[in-house]
C-alpha cells in the first residue's frame, strides 16, 4: 500500500480468483483514543472500533472511503483505491490501446518543433468518475524538470456503438535547447483513477522521435505562361524551429486527381517551391518533414488546381 | 561560442555535400545493423545512449547558430580549444568561432573513425561473420575529414590482446551508430546553416 496523495492510498493486488488479498491497517488521524468507530462509504454499518482498523482487501467491494467517527462527528477519511496486477502485468482497463506505432501504445505524444514543448493524448470509453494526473521529467535516475498542465478532454468521437473520449496534456521542458543532442529520454507518467480503480501509464521518448511539423503555410499557385505547368510555393510553418537554415525541412508535393484511384504524382524537394503539372479538378498538396532526421511527416496543406 | 552570420564566397562549401553523404551512409549502416542484429538490443529504445565525444569535443556548443545564443539553455560552460586551419574555411572573413566549430566536427569524425576501425577489426574475427562496417561509410568519414583538412595528431588505432566478446562488440556497434547518426544530423544542420550564411 502506498499514498497517492493526502488521505488517498493505493492497494496493489495480485488479481486472480480466490486470491488472499492484502491486509491493510488504517489509522484514524486524531488524538482521540476511545469511542472511535469505522464505516465504509455511505453505509452506516460499523466495521470496527478503535483507533486502528485492520481489513483484508481482496476485491473492489473492500475499497472505498473509510471514515472514522466519534459521537457522530467525522474525525478523518482514508480513500482506498485498487491497482490490479494480472499475471505479473499491471492492468490497463481505463485507457484504450491505440496500437500505433505498436501494440500496447496507450499514450501518444507529438512535438511541433525542438523547443521542448510537446503534447500527449490518450483515449478511453469511460465518460464519468474519471481523473488523470500527469508528471514528466527528462531521464529517471537524475530527473530534470518538465512542467505539464492539467489533462483536458480534447475530443469526443462515436466509434460503432461506443463513444470514445480523447484527453490531452501539454508539457514543456524547463530548460530546453533546440539544438541539443538528446541522450536521456523524456518520461511521461499518467495516473488514471476510475471510480476505485487506479492505473498508471508511462511513455518514454526523445523529442527528435516525436517531431511532427505543422503543415507548410501560404501554399500558392502561379500559372506558368503557355504551359499546363504551375509554380507551387509555400513557406515554413510559423511553429517550426528557427533558424530555418539550421532546422531545415524537406517537402513532398503531390498532385491528386478528384478520384482517389487516380495516379498521384509526387515530387520531393528541399526548396519552398516546385513546378508541377496541374490537371483539371486536381488538387496540389504539400507536406513537410525534418530534412535530416526522419520523424513524422506533417499533415498535408492543399489547394485546388482550378 | 556561436556562429556569426558571415557572407561567404560563392561555392565555399564543399563540406555540405560531404556531410549529406555522411548522414545517408550512417543512416543506411544503422538500418542494416538493426536488421542484421534483430536478436540483439539494437533499437533506440533498448540501447544506452552514450556519446564517445562527451567532454572531449563540444560540437553542439561551438556550432550553435547565432540566433540560439540568446537561449541560456544552449550555452554550456564547457571550453575546449582547437587547431584552426581548414579548407572549408574558404573565406578569410570566417570567424574564429566558425573555425572552432569545424575543428570540433573534425575531432568528432576522427574519434568515431578510430572507434569504427577498431570495431571492424574485431568483427572481422567473428566466426559468424554476421556484420561488418560499410566501407562506404568509412570512406565518407574520410572524405569529410579531408574536406575539413585540419592538422591534428593521429590517434593510434586501439589494439586489444584479449579475445573479443562478439556479443558485446555488436551491442557497442549499435550504440556507436545511434550516437554517430545523431552527431551526423548536427553536422548536417551546421553545414546547411554555414552554407546559407
Amino acid at each position: 500500500i502506498w499514498e497517492l496523495k493526502k488521505d488517498v492510498y493505493v492497494v496493489e493486488l495480485d488479481w486472480y480468483p480466490d486470491a488472499p488479498g492484502e491486509m491493510v491497517v488504517l489509522t484514524c488521524d486524531t488524538p482521540e483514543e476511545d469511542g472511535i468507530t469505522w464505516t465504509l462509504d455511505q453505509s452506516s454499518e460499523v466495521l470496527g472500533s478503535g483507533k486502528t482498523l485492520t481489513i483484508q482487501v481482496k476485491e473492489f467491494g473492500d475499497a472505498g472511503q473509510y471514515t472514522c467517527h466519534k459521537g457522530g462527528e467525522v474525525l478523518s477519511h482514508s480513500l482506498l483505491l485498487l491497482h490490479k496486477k494480472e499475471d505479473g502485468i499491471w492492468s490497463t482497463d481505463i485507457l484504450k490501446d491505440q496500437k500505433e506505432p505498436k501494440n500496447k501504445t496507450f499514450l501518444r505524444c507529438e512535438a511541433k518543433n525542438y523547443s521542448g514543448r510537446f503534447t500527449c493524448w490518450w483515449l478511453t470509453t469511460i465518460s464519468t468518475d474519471l481523473t488523470f494526473s500527469v508528471k514528466s521529467s527528462r531521464g529517471s535516475s537524475d530527473p530534470q524538470g518538465v512542467t505539464c498542465g492539467a489533462a483536458t478532454l480534447s475530443a469526443e468521437r462515436v466509434r460503432g456503438d461506443n463513444k470514445e473520449y480523447e484527453y490531452s496534456v501539454e508539457c514543456q521542458e524547463d530548460s530546453a535547447c533546440p539544438a541539443a543532442e538528446e541522450s536521456l529520454p523524456i518520461e511521461v507518467m499518467v495516473d488514471a483513477v476510475h471510480k476505485l480503480k487506479y492505473e498508471n501509464y508511462t511513455s518514454s521518448f526523445f523529442i527528435r522521435d516525436i517531431i511532427k511539423p505543422d503543415p507548410p503555410k501560404n501554399l500558392q499557385l502561379k500559372p506558368l505562361k503557355n504551359s499546363r505547368q504551375v509554380e507551387v510555393s509555400w513557406e515554413y510553418p510559423d511553429t517550426w524551429s528557427t533558424p530555418h537554415s539550421y532546422f531545415s525541412l524537406t517537402f513532398c508535393v503531390q498532385v491528386q486527381g478528384k478520384s482517389k484511384r487516380e495516379k498521384k504524382d509526387r515530387v520531393f524537394t528541399d526548396k519552398t517551391s516546385a513546378t508541377v503539372i496541374c490537371r483539371k479538378n486536381a488538387s496540389i498538396s504539400v507536406r513537410a518533414q525534418d530534412r535530416y532526421y526522419s520523424s513524422s511527416w506533417s499533415e498535408w496543406a492543399s489547394v485546388p488546381c482550378s | 561560442r556561436n556562429l556569426p552570420v558571415a557572407t561567404p564566397d560563392p561555392g565555399m562549401f564543399p563540406c555540405l555535400h560531404h556531410s549529406q553523404n555522411l548522414l545517408r551512409a550512417v543512416s543506411n549502416m544503422l538500418q542494416k545493423a538493426r536488421q542484421t542484429l534483430e536478436f540483439y538490443p539494437c533499437t533506440s529504445e533498448e540501447i544506452d545512449h552514450e556519446d564517445i565525444t562527451k567532454d572531449k569535443t563540444s560540437t553542439v556548443e561551438a556550432c550553435l547558430p547565432l540566433e540560439l545564443t540568446k537561449n541560456e539553455s544552449c550555452l554550456n560552460s564547457r571550453e575546449t580549444s582547437f587547431i584552426t586551419n581548414g579548407s572549408c574555411l574558404a573565406s578569410r572573413k570566417t570567424s574564429f568561432m566558425m573555425a572552432l566549430c569545424l575543428s570540433s566536427i573534425y575531432e568528432d569524425l576522427k574519434m568515431y573513425q578510430v572507434e569504427f576501425k577498431t570495431m571492424n577489426a574485431k568483427l572481422l574475427m567473428d566466426p559468424k561473420r554476421q556484420i561488418f562496417l560499410d566501407q562506404n561509410m568509412l570512406a565518407v568519414i574520410d572524405e569529410l575529414m579531408q574536406a575539413l583538412n585540419f592538422n591534428s595528431e593521429t590517434v593510434p588505432q586501439k589494439s586489444s590482446l584479449e579475445e573479443p566478446d562478439f556479443y558485446k562488440t555488436k551491442i557497442k556497434l549499435c550504440i556507436l551508430l545511434h550516437a554517430f547518426r545523431i552527431r551526423a544530423v548536427t553536422i548536417d544542420r551546421v553545414m546547411s546553416y554555414l552554407n546559407a550564411s
Epitope: D14, W15, Y16, P17, D18, A19, E59, F60, K85, E86, D87, G88, I89, D93, K102, N103, K104, T125 | F39, P41
Partner: antibody, heavy 115, light 112 residues
Framework: QVQLVQSGGGVVQPGRSLRLSCAAS????????MHWVRQAPGKGLEWVAF????????YYADSVKGRFTISRDNSKNTLYLQMKSLRAEDTAVYYC????????WGQGTMVTVSS | SYVLTQPPSVSGTPGQRVTISCSGG????????VKWYQQLPGTAPKLLIY???QRPSGVPDRFSGSKSGTSASLAITGVQAEDEADYYC????????????FGTGTKVTVLG
Amino acid sequence: QVQLVQSGGGVVQPGRSLRLSCAASGFTFSSYGMHWVRQAPGKGLEWVAFIRYDGSNKYYADSVKGRFTISRDNSKNTLYLQMKSLRAEDTAVYYCKTHGSHDNWGQGTMVTVSS
Amino acid sequence: SYVLTQPPSVSGTPGQRVTISCSGGRSNIGSDTVKWYQQLPGTAPKLLIYGNDQRPSGVPDRFSGSKSGTSASLAITGVQAEDEADYYCQSYDRGTHPALLFGTGTKVTVLG
C-alpha cells in the same frame, strides 16, 4: 472454491458450428479475464482466445480469427466459445481458464471435426 | 507455431535431479515472467511455478523454477514416479499480450 464446468463438445462435420460453454462458480466471475486453450490429440497446448472481465476487449489466435467468437454473460457467470466453419485441424480438447498468476482450468471438453 | 522451445523428452531415475529448459526471445521470456505446468494423462494442466520461481501452495518443494535472460528452466530435485507427465512452460509476448505463449512441451519419464 473456484470451479469451471465445461459443456458443449461433441462430433461435428467440417464447415459446421458448435458452441462451448464454461460455467463459473466460487468467485466473482465478472471481475476476471478468461481464456480458451486447446490441445489436439497427442499435441501441445495452444492458446485460442481471451476476453476481458467486462467483455470490452477480445483477442484471438491467428488460426481461429474470423471463425471463432469468445463471449461472456456475467449475469449468468458463463463464458462461451462460438466456433464456426470448423475444420479437421480444430479437433482438440478445449479448456477454459481464468487469467492471473494463479489460474484455474475447466475439466476440458472434446471437439471432434470429422465427416 | 511455437516460439518457446523445450526438449521433447527428458528422463531420470527416482531421486535424480531432472531439468527442463525453455528457450525464448527478448520479446517474451526476456521481458516477461514464466509459468510451468504439469499435465498428467487425460487431465487439465496444473500450475507448478508462476512468476519465474514462485511455487503455489500445495506444490512440493522439489519443483523449482528459474529464469536467465531469454531462457527459463524447471528443476525437479529427487524426481518421483508420480512426476511422470508432460511439462509446459508459458509466457507472454510483449507485442501480443494477453495471448498465452506455450512451450512445445516436454515428456518426463521416470525410469526403473
